[in-house]
């Protein structure tokens, strides 16, 4: 009796259970009682990751400069290429078909993580004895000055946004 | 259904070329099988000749030396033999196969 | 190239008898695939070869199930469970794993 299912990395076609392509191969021609499934690799910019039954191979990612993009990792015959964003720029979303700009943290606000090619920079509120006075991608909240350990005094207290003026102590006359 | 049937002389003289085709219907000879030539001498053993495949490209018995050619005509959907510089021990029934469907055969004398 | 050897040659079989045909290759009809291209045929007086097995024990479509196909690597056999009168023909093994194909010379099988 013809199959009605076949073995792992095998398909049914017309009675007839035939190998399927390794990755980095499509397929030529199926099987038949007398021939194996015949295979021809993907030509420079295609690939195919998985064992199948394709005609056709997939291209390779482009990753366009215009969009803000970069290879990270060129393609195989096996993989897809790999796009990250260019310094500066992340990716919009998983797939990274194109990047936007870092976003900065404002004053009062300081960068927990800094931003890669794939992730955003993530901003935290200065906590109180913190602050940030500038927009940047980078900068982190700094600690208010300490005017005790410069034998000085607060005359202005700091905030989230601003440090605090150390000032000469009173003297006792 | 599958079909397949020979065409040629059934008489050629020693030294000339022979000729045949075998007209395929109910398949397209642009699909994956391979398309063979198969002979049998009179009250003898079958003979694998050669094959061409869905793609043109194809492989010979190198018993036929460099006698033997099997060339496509997609357009009619047959494909053909020649063969060169006979001799009366090329006196056979010619098949032309898929090998699970076969023409009917037709007889070509070698002699002058 | 790959020689197959058929045994016996003669096979006189009384009607409703089991009948076997053995088949030997001089090297194995295994591919790197794990696929072994051994055919049976079956050639009635008059009349062109009829696939019978394929892949050394696949059926083909229409063949009645008293025929069966076993073996492996260099040794195969061809099994009728019950012969009947129109059994009766040349039966011939091919292998297509390796090229040039080649046949087997052929067991005659004939009523007692």
């Known amino acids: 009796e013809p199959p009605t299912a076949c073995r792992e990395k095998q398909y049914l076609i017309n009675s007839q259970c035939c190998s399927l392509c390794q990755p980095g191969q499509k397929l030529v021609s199926d099987c038949t009682e007398f021939t194996e499934t015949e295979c021809l690799p993907c030509s420079e910019s295609e690939f195919l990751d998985t064992w199948n039954r394709e005609t056709r191979c997939h291209q390779h990612k482009y990753c366009d400069p215009n969009l803000g993009l970069r290879v990270q990792q060129k393609g195989t015959s096996e993989t897809d290429t790999i796009c990250t964003c260019e310094e500066g720029l992340h990716c919009m979303s998983e797939s990274c078909e194109s990047c936007v700009p870092h976003r900065s943290c404002l004053p009062g606000f300081g960068v927990k993580q800094i931003a890669t090619g794939v992730s955003d920079t993530i901003c935290e509120p200065c906590p109180v004895g913190f602050f940030s006075n500038v927009s940047s991608a980078f900068e982190k909240c700094r600690p208010w000055t300490s005017c005790e350990t410069k034998d000085l005094v607060v005359q202005q207290a700091g905030t989230n946004k601003t440090d605090v003026v150390c000032g000469p102590q009173d003297r006792q006359r | 259904q599958v079909q397949l049937q020979e065409s040629g002389p059934g008489l050629v003289k020693p030294s000339d070329t022979l000729s045949l085709t075998c007209a395929v219907s109910?398949?397209?000879?642009?699909?994956?099988?391979?398309w063979n030539w198969i002979r049998q001498p009179p009250g003898n053993k079958l003979e694998w000749m050669g094959y061409?495949?869905?793609?043109?490209?194809?492989n010979y018995n190198p018993s036929l030396k460099n006698r033997i050619t099997i060339s496509v005509d997609t357009s009619k959907n047959q494909f053909s033999l020649k063969l060169s510089s006979v001799t009366a021990v090329d006196t056979a029934v010619y098949y032309c196969?898929?090998?699970?469907?076969w023409g009917q055969g037709t007889l070509v004398t070698v002699s002058s | 190239d790959v020689v197959l050897t058929q045994s016996p040659l003669s096979l006189p079989v009384t009607l409703g008898q089991p009948a076997s045909i053995s088949c030997r290759s001089s090297?194995?009809?295994?591919?790197?695939?794990?696929?072994?291209?051994l055919n049976w045929f079956q050639q009635r007086p008059g009349q062109s070869p009829r696939l019978l097995i394929y892949?050394?024990?696949n059926r083909f479509s229409g063949v009645p199930d008293r025929f069966s196909g076993s073996g492996s690597g260099t040794d195969f056999t061809l099994k009728i469970s019950r012969v009947e009168a129109e059994d009766v023909g040349v039966y011939y093994c091919?292998?297509?794993?390796?090229?040039?194909?080649?046949f087997g010379q052929g067991t005659k099988l004939e009523i007692k």
């Open positions: 196969a898929r090998l699970d469907y």
């Open positions: 109910g398949y397209s000879i642009t699909t994956n099988y391979y």
């Open positions: 061409i495949k869905y793609d043109g490209s194809n």
């Open positions: 090297q194995s009809l295994e591919n790197s695939n794990g696929n072994t291209f």
């Open positions: 892949k050394v024990s």
């Open positions: 091919l292998q297509v794993t390796h090229v040039p194909f080649t």
